[in-house]
């Protein structure tokens, strides 16, 4: 019963997910993962926030909205056909079995036309981000499945940015939203 969202190859995909913090700055941990939401966590985690900040993400996955106000919608940059599938947004509300989870289905269509880019911007410069990841001991093994390779410098066209901002506005009302508190 997942909601379906569409994007074309080469575009940025937008998967909406929202919650209303109980009080300003009173954030709830959120994770995004590839695959349907399991009983705990988010399958293969691609991005997560804690009570303060985005504390883990992988290349091409980022939050473009104001997550401090509960907009935890996921943007996937420069999608390929391999990005098709179900994604999990999980709002990790503290307590006994309080998590809210949403399955969103992303359908990637082949690009109709490949426009010649007129101007390029470095997303790392345009959207600087702090990254804090949790360390594992040397004997740890985590299988992350078919996650994309990390490429810290992500390039996208200005046209994509503009299109995505319009798409985000169009989809915002249809996104998964919960109120906390």
């Amino acid at each position: 019963s997942e909601v379906e969202y569409r994007a074309e190859v080469g575009q940025n995909a937008y998967l909406p997910c929202f919650y209303t913090p109980a009080a300003p700055g009173n954030l709830v941990p959120v994770c995004w993962g590839k695959g349907a939401c399991p009983v705990f966590e988010c399958g293969n985690v691609v991005l997560r926030t804690d009570e303060r900040d985005v504390n883990y993400w992988t290349s091409r996955y980022w939050l473009n909205g104001d997550f401090r106000k509960g907009d935890v919608s996921l943007t996937i940059e420069n999608v390929t056909l391999a990005d098709s599938g179900i994604y999990c947004c999980r709002i990790q509300i503290p307590g006994i079995m309080n998590d809210e989870k949403f399955n969103l289905k992303l359908v990637i269509k082949p690009a109709k036309v490949t426009p010649a880019p007129t101007r390029q911007r470095d997303f790392t410069a345009a959207f600087p981000r702090m990254l804090t990841t949790r360390g594992h001991g040397p004997a740890e093994t985590q299988t992350l499945g078919s996650l994309p390779d990390i490429n810290l410098t992500q390039i996208s066209t200005l046209a994509n940015e503009l299109r995505d901002s319009r798409l985000a506005n169009d989809l915002r009302d249809s996104g998964a939203t919960i109120r906390i508190g």
């Epitope: 009983v39 705990f40 293969n44 509300i93 307590g95 985590q142 992350l144």
Partner: antibody, heavy 122, light 107 residues
Framework: EVKLVESGGGLVQPGGSLRLSCAAS????????MAWVRQAPGKGLEWVAN????????YYLDSLKSRFTISRDNAKNSLYLQMNSLKAEDTAVYYC???????????????WGQGTLVTVSS | DIQMTQSPSSLSASVGDRVTITCRAS??????LAWYQQKPGKSPQLLVY???TLAEGVPSRFSGSGSGTDFTLTISSLQPEDFASYYC?????????FGQGTKLEIK
């Protein structure tokens, strides 16, 4: 080497209480969900409860959540199960198990303790 | 609750045989399925997670397959140490649930 060692089991009368402990070593304890699973004599496996990394979220078998409480102390690398109002049907070997990690991916109880026997009888 | 039904409940086989145990979920659990082996008086041991990924240290004669509601555990050539009980378990819905078990005995 990952090691989980349960303790605290024993004989208790119906209506009594017990607190089980599980000492973890060989991995970064705070990076994993942890679980309790039980097995009645001659029976199959039954999930009891799970707890997230910092203890802020807990998950229970519905029929047990009013009597059992799972908790953890990351500073001590320890997992606990407080069992109250015990019944004869709670008699089982209780296992501590390591569940999914911080980055997801591995959905299965990868490591188990040796188990501790809880016997509820008058 | 998601019910997990294993079949057969018991099975007699000989060393060298190929054995398949099946597990059916009452609802779609995608690939969130694990298989465990348990010997008498011992703790369970993870064999397969995410339906088909072999756990660390598990011999390659074990394999898992399936997704959605139907899953199988296959032992390609039974060894003497494989005679034990086997359980499937889903990690998709709460509560987590196990199959009732399959006891694999020597013929």
């Amino acid at each position: 080497e990952v090691k989980l060692v349960e303790s605290g089991g024993g004989l208790v009368q119906p209506g009594g209480s017990l607190r089980l402990s599980c000492a973890a070593s060989g991995f970064t304890f705070s990076d994993y969900y942890m679980a309790w699973v039980r097995q009645a004599p001659g029976k199959g496996l039954e999930w009891v409860a799970n707890i997230n990394y910092d203890g802020s979220s807990t998950y229970y078998l519905d029929s047990l959540k009013s009597r059992f409480t799972i908790s953890r102390d990351n500073a001590k690398n320890s997992l606990y199960l407080q069992m109250n109002s015990l019944k004869a049907e709670d008699t089982a070997v209780y296992y501590c198990a390591r569940d999914v990690g911080y980055y997801g991916g591995n959905y299965g109880f990868a490591y188990w303790g040796q188990g501790t026997l809880v016997t509820v009888s008058s | 609750d998601i019910q997990m039904t294993q079949s057969p409940s018991s099975l007699s086989a000989s060393v060298g045989d190929r054995v398949t145990i099946t597990c059916r979920a009452s609802d779609n659990i995608y690939s969130y399925l694990a298989w465990y082996q348990q010997k008498p008086g011992k703790s369970p041991q993870l064999l397969v997670y995410n339906a088909k990924t072999l756990a660390e240290g598990v011999p390659s004669r074990f394999s898992g397959s399936g997704s959605g509601t139907d899953f199988t555990l296959t032992i390609s050539s039974l060894q003497p140490e494989d005679f034990a009980s086997y359980y499937c378990q889903q990690h998709y819905g709460s509560p987590l649930t196990f199959g009732q078990g399959t006891k694999l005995e020597i013929k």
